[in-house]
Interface confidence: low
């Protein structure tokens, strides 16, 4: 092993403070005790170290904790988190939601990095399921988070967590994901009255089966065309003209503009012409 350079006289760090900004990399390596660094990690984030200096501090922590950092250090990493590799993060055991929030805050305003993805994966696996507080936190930082999960991963989301989901969190979900989420949402909102229920369930309807759409058509919900266009084609096809008319209410006139697009196009082709004519929209089957 290469012999380590000795710390110059009088430069041994007694605490982590702004004076260290002026230390060269080798001086940081020689003069900052890793254990001191670990106990004063909360201060590092307030000191504008250069990226090169942060590399040295990370190296010192890596030497001190070769099996992975303890959570007491992780929660105070601050910008040093940006220096971590997914391999580093896989060694961690993060159990506190506050720790997760602190690290997500560091990456705020940026796309989800491999480091963040690994951190979230470790955290969720450690908890065993995607509980409401975790989901609330993750979707606040990354609105598309839910739709980045596989249907298998989504199956671990308890219905109670669905209350944390906002419409924009589902924007990029595909039908397979909504197939998993819809039954959970239906269960979560089952005790709400008609109009309130529809407001909550609307974003999840891309996973609804025909029978649920038929039930909704009896409740004067006035579904907008944007929601209708996201419904599963196989769920829409069996609906009668009367049921679609009741489902859309005053929005039914929008079918004309969408007559060439799925699922409207396929639905029109399944209907009898004399039934379509009752809508007065000039739809041709």
């Amino acid at each position: 092993e290469v012999e380590k350079t000795a710390c110059p006289s009088g430069k041994k760090a007694r605490e982590i403070d702004e004076s260290l900004i002026f230390y060269k990399k080798w001086e940081l390596e020689a003069c900052v005790d890793a254990a001191l660094l670990a106990t004063q990690m909360d201060r590092v984030n307030a000191i504008p170290f250069t990226y090169e200096q942060l590399d040295v501090l990370k190296h010192k922590l890596d030497e001190l904790y070769p099996q992975g950092y303890p959570e007491s250090v992780i929660q105070h990493l601050g910008y040093l988190f940006l220096k971590m590799s997914p391999e580093d993060i896989r060694k961690w055991n993060v159990t506190s939601l506050e720790t997760l929030k602190a690290l997500l805050e560091v990456n705020k305003g940026h796309e989800m990095s491999p480091q963040v993805a690994t951190l979230i994966d470790r955290f969720v696996k450690g908890r065993g399921q995607l509980d409401k507080d975790t989901l609330d936190t993750l979707t606040a930082f990354y609105p598309g988070y839910l739709c980045s999960l596989s249907p298998e991963e989504l199956s671990s989301v308890p219905p109670s967590s669905i209350w944390a989901v906002r419409p924009q969190d589902l924007d990029t979900c595909d039908p397979r994901q909504l197939d998993v989420l819809y039954p959970k949402a239906r269960l979560a909102f089952q005790n709400m009255n008609g109009s309130e229920y529809f407001v909550k369930i609307q974003s999840f309807l891309g996973g609804a089966p025909t029978e649920d759409l038929k039930a909704l058509s009896q409740q004067n919900v006035s579904m907008d065309l944007a929601t209708f266009m996201k419904l599963r084609t196989d769920a829409v096809l069996p609906l009668t003209v009367a049921e679609v008319q009741k489902l859309l209410g005053p929005h039914v006139e929008g079918l004309k503009a969408e007559e060439r697009h799925r699922p409207v196009r396929d639905w029109i082709l399944r209907q009898r012409q004399d039934d379509l004519d009752t809508l007065g929209l000039g739809l041709q089957g």
Partner: antibody, heavy 121, light 112 residues
């Protein structure tokens, strides 16, 4: 000499999105240890800190208003920005950008002249 | 959030008089490790941008007249103008940078 100059629309309608730009000259916004802030001041009222973006790209917002604001930057043009969604009359204010020296002062030593924004239908 | 409270909200003095204004924070702004108070004072003259006067509670910014003095530690801070001049007509704001940033409500200084 360090100079900051804000720009944006003088008048904007309620519910629209507002985008403001701060052009920095004489100093790089990626210089180590410096952060770049947005502050606003409604007519006849005090200063309100909105948020900041630092040299390495980290962004923080005021907890009271963060949900409606987005701060970003263009390092190639040496500019930084703030976007406000769904503006209301309460967003009528003078908007300032400033530079903060985190190493030697922890204070905002350079400010722009401000740009006045009125929200009105 | 750290709340900054300034008093008085306004005061009127004659030129040559000494004036003091107060700024209190809802939590300590003193770092035990750096031994610095993360508090700054700014002056905003009518129609102008704010200007930095004092940082770290008591360090005068370059070019600021020595009649301006900042003092205090922890949660209680004071800005003193030893002999007010006509050009000191302005609103004075304190600001914490201990955790994010917060400005006080300001003290308006008028000259009699």
């Amino acid at each position: 000499e360090v100079q900051l100059e804000e720009s944006g629309p003088a008048v904007i309608k309620p519910s629209q999105s507002l985008s403001l730009t701060c052009i920095v000259s004489g100093f790089s916004i990626t210089s180590s240890s410096y952060c770049w802030h947005w502050i606003r001041q409604p007519p006849g009222k005090g200063l309100e800190w909105m948020g900041r973006i630092c040299y390495e790209g980290s962004i923080y917002y005021s907890p009271s208003i963060k949900s409606r604001f987005t701060i970003s930057r263009d390092t190639s043009l040496n500019k930084f920005f703030i976007q406000l969604s769904s503006v209301t009359n309460e967003d009528t204010a003078m908007y300032y950008c400033s530079r903060e020296n985190r190493l030697l002062k922890d204070a905002m030593d350079y400010w722009g002249q401000g740009t006045s924004v009125t929200v009105s239908s | 959030d750290i709340v900054m409270t300034q008093s008085p909200s306004s005061l009127a003095v004659s030129a040559g008089e000494k004036v003091t204004m107060s700024c209190k924070s809802s939590q300590s702004l003193l770092s035990s490790r750096t031994r610095k108070n993360y508090l700054a004072w700014y002056q905003q003259k009518p129609g102008q941008s704010p200007k930095l006067l004092i940082y770290w509670a008591s360090t005068r910014e370059s070019g600021v007249p020595d009649r301006f003095t900042g003092s205090g530690s922890g949660t209680d801070f004071t800005l003193t103008i030893s002999s007010v001049q006509a050009e000191d007509l302005a609103v004075y704001y304190c600001k914490q940078s201990y955790n994010l940033r917060t400005f006080g409500g300001g003290t308006k200084l008028e000259i009699k």
